[in-house]
């Protein structure tokens, strides 16, 4: 069995960001399992006092695109599109710094999903980053934090 599949997103939790676009899943049954995890995580997030508005505005779509990455249409084999490293870093180090610290010390929040590790993403100017998924975090506002 080949590992990795492109299939239409059939869930509800991330539908407002993903619609029914084609997403990459590591195995055929994974979409349902991750949908359950994301739904549980969003329920927990919704009742949590640990999540600020400035963080949730971008963290939730980012988590959706990380959990259910678009398929890379330019690839001949099933391949996920990654988050953009610059946005990932602003999210982790600026907008959601305290939330990330809390989430890392509470792995049960995401259960079967790892938190995005920005260091694993290709550098912004590299060819591998050309097709990354951009959430639309306003860069300029945080540019001075970033350097």
């Amino acid at each position: 069995e080949e590992d990795g599949f492109c299939q239409p997103y059939r869930g509800i939790a991330c539908a407002r960001f993903i619609g029914n676009r084609t997403v990459y899943m590591e195995s055929l049954h994974m979409q349902g399992e991750i949908e359950n995890q994301i739904t549980a995580a969003f329920t927990m997030i919704g009742t949590s006092s640990h999540l600020s508005d400035k963080c949730s505005q971008f963290a939730i779509p980012s988590l959706c695109h990380y959990a259910f990455p678009y398929c890379d249409e330019t690839s001949s084999v099933p391949k996920p599109r990654d988050l953009c490293r610059d946005e990932c870093e602003i999210l982790e180090n600026v907008l959601c710094q305290t939330e990330y610290i809390f989430a890392r010390s509470n792995p049960m929040i995401l259960m079967r999903l790892k938190l995005p590790n920005c260091e694993d993403l290709p550098q912004p100017e590299s060819p591998e980053a050309a097709n990354c998924i951009r959430i639309g975090i306003p860069m300029a506002d945080h540019h001075h934090h970033h350097h």
């Epitope: 069995e1 080949e2 959990a67 391949k79 259960m111 079967r112 999903l113 790892k114 694993d120």
Partner: antibody, heavy 120, light 107 residues
Framework: EVQLVESGGGLVQPGGSLRLSCAAS????????IHWVRQTPGKGLEWVGY????????YHADSVKGRFTISADTSKNTAYLQMNSLRAEDTAVYYC?????????????WGQGTLVTVSS | DIQMTQSPSSLSASVGDRVTITCRAS??????VAWYQQKPGKAPKLLIY???FLYSGVPSRFSGSRSGTDFTLTISSLQPEDFATYYC?????????FGQGTKVEIK
Amino acid sequence: EVQLVESGGGLVQPGGSLRLSCAASGFNISGYYIHWVRQTPGKGLEWVGYISPLAGNTYHADSVKGRFTISADTSKNTAYLQMNSLRAEDTAVYYCARDSRRYVRPLDYWGQGTLVTVSS
Amino acid sequence: DIQMTQSPSSLSASVGDRVTITCRASQDVNTAVAWYQQKPGKAPKLLIYSASFLYSGVPSRFSGSRSGTDFTLTISSLQPEDFATYYCQQHYTTPPTFGQGTKVEIK
């Protein structure tokens, strides 16, 4: 079919070098961490290190730091373990294994292993 | 580094027996413990991860549980193909560390 195949093992003298390869098929290594784990004859498992092939980040166990280097070539879908300044205690079967970058599912596929013998 | 202390180091059992193997972490690892099975001359195979999740294709007679820093692998009814060495591993922090192994032999 998901497969990891190690090669490059053999007999080497103390102080010598070897380069092990881990060729992956059935999946793209960019979406995974590739780990190296070794097993000394009749003993347990020891983690050697891993690489995140997409970004090239590597982590090594203290016991091999400065002597072993992990690398990857995503175009060849292959990871490597360069072993320098080999010692008798490095004698082991070396396995590569994958670990999803996205999902909590540790070391779900392993290669068959390649034997490295360090002896004069 | 986190130490994983596994016990017993070996055990003898018969087909149909219920077998329990324990692993104790030297510090909190949450639920981040995996169990592997290894047969002579073969690579380890993943059985359980995140303490209690059964890996795809693994028979339901295998189960895992957690109590604090103690983790248990249970084989509810030992089958002939289950005679092997079992290892626990924490996947909470780098470096990931393994237990010393438990060899399950035929009585």
